[in-house]
């Protein structure tokens, strides 16, 4: 199934998506939409780019904060709410005989955890699960198959997100 990313209400969610412009600088249109990628284009488009720039955003909360001109089209959703939960489609509309790349990612928005974690927990968890964290300041997450991530239970996720609520981090799970 889709790779899942977990963010806390009120924080920024980061949904990775990227491609390699070939040749460099030769950008292609990209759309982000709410809902799994349909047969064509994106459903419920939240952001669209053309060959030069972002030309359509349905809300000021949706941003491409990475290096768009190098193919980083990762979506940042600012100040997420529970209603932002769901599957998102990143579609890279490569010209040619239907060479579109389709990426479905799932955003899970959770309420702030009530538990106060031990001071060392974040350091322990991030070393135990080093590839689970991405933030809006980073480039695209390294490519992994959904099964390549270590197991983590919900208690750990809730506790970890509570630790990270000030960083705007999004947690990636399989």
């Amino acid at each position: 199934s889709e790779v899942e990313y977990i963010a806390e209400v009120g924080q920024n969610a980061y949904l990775p998506c990227s491609y390699t412009p070939a040749p460099p600088g030769n950008l292609v249109p990209v759309c982000w939409g709410k809902g799994a990628c349909p047969v064509f284009d994106c459903s419920n488009v939240v952001l669209r780019t053309d060959n030069r720039d972002v030309n359509d955003r349905t809300s000021g909360r949706y941003w491409l904060k990475g290096d768009f001109h190098k193919g980083d089209v990762s979506l940042t959703i600012e100040n997420v709410t529970l209603a932002d939960s769901g599957v998102y489609c990143c579609r890279i509309q490569i010209p040619g005989i239907m060479n579109d790349e389709k990426h479905n990612v799932k955003l899970v928005v959770i309420k702030p955890a009530k538990v106060t974690p031990a001071p060392t927990l974040q350091r322990d968890l991030t070393s135990a699960f080093p590839r689970m964290l991405t933030t809006g300041e980073h480039g695209p997450a390294e490519t992994q198959t959904p099964g390549s991530l270590p197991d983590v239970n919900l208690t750990q996720i809730f506790t970890l997100t509570n630790e990270l609520r000030d960083s705007g981090a999004t947690i990636r799970t399989a």
Epitope: S1, P29, C37, P38, V39, F40, S43, M98
Partner: antibody
């Protein structure tokens, strides 16, 4: 509400060209979506033929690539199918369809290729 | 091209029955599969997207499942309006290809 309506000749002779029109109402073909042609052969097999999208980009089924052309007239909000060198194998009901998941369909126009 | 093998090609069932139609792709299509329903003299209509997501207005007695190269459509508690033709569509790779269809008839 998006509505599509196909129109065409009904009967075409072998080796001639087929031209069909899809007239779209309730939505601008330059706003969004891919605007497709799909045909259904006697026996009900469905075949995707190709599309022109809102920006004018086209893509065709490779099995038809040398014979097919899809164009549009944005002033009339219409898009067109041209299929060259038709044979009796092209006898089918032709549908125009659109939406991210083929959400909207015309009623279809039946084409017979016969001498 | 990806070939979609749909089975059965036809089947008969009674009102209230539960039936399952399957589609098998010649390769993994990563859930890029839709289902369509067609009634006589009408165009196909969009039924299910991305294996499990029901199109707007589709009753909950319809459900989809599957992954990899194997997918299925289940209709539980059949109603008279459900007797029709059903087609799967893969959109993992172009050209888009449909299954050959399943005719569901009243027993």
């Amino acid at each position: 509400d998006v509505q599509l309506q196909e129109s065409g000749p009904g009967l075409v002779k072998p080796s001639q060209s087929l031209s069909l029109t899809c007239t779209v109402t309730g939505y601008s073909i330059t706003s969004d979506y891919a605007w497709n042609w799909i045909r259904q052969f006697p026996g009900n097999k469905l075949e995707w033929m190709g599309y022109i999208n809102y920006s004018g980009r086209t893509s065709y089924n490779p099995s038809l690539k040398s014979r097919i052309s899809i164009t549009r007239d944005t002033s009339k909000n219409q898009f067109f199918l041209q299929l060259n060198s038709v044979t009796t194998e092209d006898t089918a009901t032709y549908y125009c369809t659109s939406g991210g998941n083929f959400d909207y369909w015309g009623q279809g126009t039946t084409l017979t290729v016969s001498s | 091209d990806i070939v979609m093998t749909q089975s059965p090609s036809s089947m008969s069932a009674s009102l209230g029955d539960r039936i399952t139609i399957t589609c098998q792709a010649t390769q993994d299509i990563v859930k890029n599969l839709n289902w369509y329903q067609q009634k006589p003299g009408k165009p196909p209509s969009f039924l299910i997207h991305y294996v499990t997501e029901l199109a707007e207005g589709v009753p909950s007695r319809f459900s989809g499942s599957g992954s990899g190269s194997d997918y299925s459509l289940t209709i539980s508690n059949l109603e008279s309006e459900d007797f029709a033709d059903y087609y799967c569509l893969q959109f993992y790779e172009f050209p888009l290809t449909f299954g050959a269809g399943t005719k569901l008839e009243l027993k």
